[in-house]
Interface confidence: low
């Protein structure tokens, strides 16, 4: 039988006692950045070409032996992994490797520098097809080497990180908080978070998404047949970059942002215990497992979205927060949220020429989160048109009133404090989906795009308050692009989306003791490309 | 993910301009940013990144280098270029005195400087 | 210059209501929150709650919630403190004093001079 | 709610002594992301209205003289008056703004 954790990023379709999917990744180049490797090994013999970089600092300590098994070990093991001939997920893909960890799997910000640059340099001379970078290596915060992931991101190479070790936000270590990485948490057979001696994976909004990184099976360096058993967000992060090769190879004209977005679709949904992970870091902690996609075609007609939640604003009461999407991504809705529930809303703003979303705090609240939903949407054009608080008791209200713009989210901010404390509720009339409504005191602000055969229609889901959390989902073929709390209770904390479903959080009431009018309603706005569906049937 | 002015350590030098008897001086009120590592037992100091503003070209990156090096030399202390990055990002590696921050921060060009610092196999 | 100017002495009856008033002046009134701190004879300070003049949003100290009312009229910027239901208890000073509306500056950095509110029968 | 805790709550000490009054809280007034621990000090003299001195735990407020010091973080604070003055003769508060408002019961500081 196949290593649980090959079969658990297989899809049914291929699940066979041989793991053998379509293409493995033979048009994809996969860059390791890590220990030396034995690279006569029987697993990846001939598959990965060992280049001439190397810049690692001294061993520590005087009576340190060198022993080649030990200096290759942790390389080996995951060159095995993405494509190692039994026990590989990309078992096509080519390799090479750079050493920048010592033989204690110690490196340097400075020499991870030096090999980013060296493959930037190497793209240049010898451009080849589809590249991953894949760096199984954690520091503290780096800003230039986040920058310097960055740039060669937007270069068009795809890198992969470890989310780190230490039981912690993953966001206080780089390369794993850089936005442009592919950040990857560990898992295991149980769909736990995988815990190693006294820590264990990393977590929080850093995490792109998780994958099996306990017990994985791959190529040892103590023989060149030797195989053993390593975990680690390393071994995790190794499992993406040979599902990013295996997609890359399929679709080879992918950018990194239709490659994430796909990654996160094809992730199996809620399987991953919460109760790990510190309570405060659950919500931002993506529950997703990664799994290659069922077909290597046919993605295409899909609206892909995913949400991005921003650093935590702080208390100050005028502290904002901004959740910002990748370069080729459209902001298509915006929401907040804050433990406390005092928050003044959110609003879409321009900064350098993109939408943001941006969150703000109130006096007395511990601070908020934006959250912005970020989809693929080619050739959009989206605006955000906004109602001052309106002076009559109606309420404020805006809609989408150019020809052929559809509204994609509803965002509302106000600047009074504990907004709907003492208003009365504000409904939505009937038969009017189209627009964004809000209470009387608040700016509302629509989001409205235009993009060739782009529908998308409005679901509520009320429940009468006191109620901790109401949801409401987008049907099957649908993508959920806004999600909001109609106002109508003070005590909403605020919306966000997971996955394709909406979710408004309320205080609890029975720590507050007070009890609410009317209903907490979560709103959903779900959309679909009848012309990405058009343009992949022709591909067929 | 994280943003640029996310959650670690930074110490900012907030430097006036000045010549240093030399060309080139950053503008008026300008100034530079030096960042380490939050968890000090990762921290290498003495050996600095120094960065440089987004289109400077490689032959800057090194004039800049060997003016740190001659104004390092005048005061008396010994400076090491070890490598001038082109390529992803503007500047160079340099092996110094944790005292020739102040002077570094006040170079034509530079946008920050960050020391080196650990990274772990994971 | 800043000043808070708090209204007079009052004495009053158990059951009864007193009504204090603070006067801001040389600042605007609306960047600053006004909390109402009171001190029985003898005794220490105690923090009743505040009001945030720009949108009237108050918050209360748990054991006040239930009879203590803050308003304020930002036209003469003027904040005001009614207490209810009056005890013996309830003799103190009263003084109201201002907290900028901005970042953590969450300390009280100009007092009014106090009324004294004397409870008897 | 967070308790304050003033030691000693009465003392006594002569023109030009050094004074240290101390403060706990009950819980961390350290605010982790801004590195601001939500605690002032303020004085007051009989029938007076109390007066600002330290905030953020060890910042003078203007105006108020430098033998005025704060220090601490977390849960353990100190007002030091490093050598007292006639006019320093009062009763000196704490006071939490970490979560809501909270002052200690006061520390009143006598002429020996």
């Known amino acids: 039988s196949i290593p649980w954790n090959l079969e658990r990023i297989t899809p049914p379709r291929y699940r066979a006692d041989e793991y053998q999917p379509p293409d493995g990744g033979s048009l994809v180049e996969v860059y390791l950045l890590d220990t030396s490797i034995q690279s006569d090994h029987r697993e990846i013999e001939g598959r990965v070409m060992v280049t001439d970089f190397e810049n690692v600092p001294e061993e520590d300590g005087t009576r340190f032996h060198r022993q080649a098994s030990k200096c290759d070990s942790h390389g080996t093991h995951l060159a095995g992994v993405v494509s190692g001939r039994d026990a590989g997920v990309a078992k096509g893909a080519s390799m090479r490797s750079l050493r920048v960890l010592n033989c204690q799997g110690k490196g340097t910000v400075s020499g991870t520098l030096i090999g980013l640059e060296f493959i930037r340099k190497s793209q240049l001379v010898q451009p080849v097809g589809p590249l991953v970078v894949l760096l199984p290596l954690a520091g503290g915060y780096s800003r230039v080497l986040n920058a310097a992931c960055q740039r060669l991101a937007r270069a068009g190479v795809v890198l992969v990180t470890a989310a780190g070790n230490f039981r912690d936000d993953a966001c206080l270590y780089s390369p794993a908080s850089a936005p442009e990485v592919i950040t990857v948490g560990a898992t295991n057979a149980q769909d736990q978070p995988v815990t190693l001696g006294t820590l264990g994976t990393n977590f929080g909004r850093c995490v792109d998404l998780f994958a099996p990184g306990e017990d994985i099976i791959g190529a040892s360096s103590y023989c060149s047949t030797c195989f053993v058993s390593q975990s680690g967000t390393s071994q995790a992060a190794a499992h993406v970059a040979g599902i990013a090769a295996m997609m890359l190879s399929a679709e080879p004209e992918l950018t990194l942002a239709e490659l994430r977005q796909r990654l996160i679709h094809f992730s199996a949904k809620d399987v991953i215990n919460e109760a790990w992970f510190p309570e405060d870091q659950r919500v931002l902690t993506p529950n997703l497992v990664a799994a290659l996609p069922p077909s290597t075609h046919g993605a295409g007609w899909q609206l892909f979205c995913r949400t991005v939640w921003s650093a935590h604003s702080g208390p100050t009461r005028m502290a904002t927060a901004v959740a910002r999407c990748a370069p080729d991504e459209e902001l298509l809705s915006c929401s907040s949220f804050s433990r406390s529930g005092k928050r003044r809303g959110e609003r879409m703003e321009a900064q350098g020429g993109k939408l943001v979303c941006r969150a703000h705090n109130a006096f007395g609240g511990e601070g908020v989160y934006a959250i912005a939903r970020c989809c693929l949407l080619p050739q959009a054009n989206c605006s955000v048109h906004t109602a001052p608080p309106a002076e009559a008791s109606m309420g404020t209200r805006v809609h989408c009133h150019q020809q052929g713009h559809v509204l994609t989210g509803c965002s509302s901010h106000w600047e009074v404090e504990d907004l709907g404390t003492h208003k009365p509720p504000v409904l939505r009339p009937r038969g009017q989906p189209n627009q964004c409504v809000g209470h009387r005191e608040a700016s509302i602000h629509a989001s409205c795009c235009h993009a060739p055969g782009l529908e998308c229609k409005v679901k509520e889901h009320g429940i009468p308050a006191p109620q901790e959390q109401v949801t409401v989902a987008c049907e099957e073929g649908w993508t959920l692009t806004g999600c909001s709390a109609l106002p109508g209770t003070s005590h909403v904390l605020g919306a966000y989306a997971v996955d394709n479903t909406c979710v408004v959080r309320s205080r609890d009431v029975s720590t507050t003791g007070s009890t609410s009018e009317g209903a907490v309603t979560a709103v959903a706005i779900c959309c679909r490309s009848r012309h990405l569906a058009q343009a992949s049937q022709e591909l067929q | 993910q994280e943003d640029e002015d996310g959650d670690y350590e930074e110490l900012v030098l907030a430097l006036r301009s000045e010549e240093d008897g030399l060309a080139e001086a950053p503008e008026h009120g300008t100034t530079a940013t030096f960042h380490r590592c939050a968890k000090d037992p990762w921290r290498l100091p003495g050996t600095y990144v120094v960065v440089l503003k987004e289109e400077t070209h490689l032959s800057q990156s090194e004039r800049t280098a060997r003016r740190l090096q001659a104004q390092a030399a005048r005061r008396g202390y010994l400076t090491k270029i070890l490598h001038v990055f082109h390529g992803l990002l503007p500047g160079f590696l340099v092996k110094m005195s944790g005292d020739l921050l102040e002077l570094a921060l006040k170079l034509p060009h530079v946008d920050y400087i960050e020391e080196d610092s650990s990274v772990f196999a994971q | 210059q800043v000043q808070l100017v708090q209204s007079g002495a009052e004495v009053k009856k158990p059951g009864a209501s007193v009504k204090v008033s603070c006067k801001a002046s040389g600042y605007t009134f609306n960047d600053y929150w006004m909390h109402w701190v009171r001190q029985a004879p003898g005794q220490g300070l105690e923090w009743m709650g505040y009001i945030n003049p720009s949108s009237g949003f108050t918050k209360y100290h748990q054991n006040f919630k239930d009879r203590v009312t803050m308003t304020a009229d930002k036209s003469i910027s003027t904040a005001y403190m009614e207490l209810s239901r009056l005890t013996s208890d309830d003799t103190a000073v009263y003084y109201c004093?201002?907290?900028?509306?901005?970042?953590?500056?969450?300390?009280?950095?100009?007092w009014g001079q106090g009324t004294t509110v004397t409870v008897s029968s | 709610d967070i308790v304050m805790s003033q030691s000693p709550s009465s003392l006594s000490a002569s023109v030009g002594d050094r004074v240290t009054i101390t403060c706990k809280s009950s819980q961390s007034l350290l605010n982790s992301r801004t590195r601001k621990n939500f605690l002032a000090w303020y004085q007051q003299k009989p029938g007076k209205s109390p007066k600002l001195l330290i905030y953020?735990?060890?910042t003078r407020e203007s105006g108020v003289p430098d033998r005025f010091s704060g220090s601490g973080s977390g849960t353990d604070f100190t007002l030091t008056i490093s050598s007292l003055q006639p006019e320093d003769f009062a009763t000196y508060y704490c006071?939490?703004?970490?979560?809501?408002?909270?002052f200690g019961q006061g520390t009143k500081l006598e002429i020996k």
């Open positions: 004093a201002r907290q900028y509306d901005y970042d953590e500056d969450w300390y009280f950095d100009v």
């Open positions: 953020w735990a060890s």
């Open positions: 006071k939490q703004s970490f979560n809501l408002f909270t």
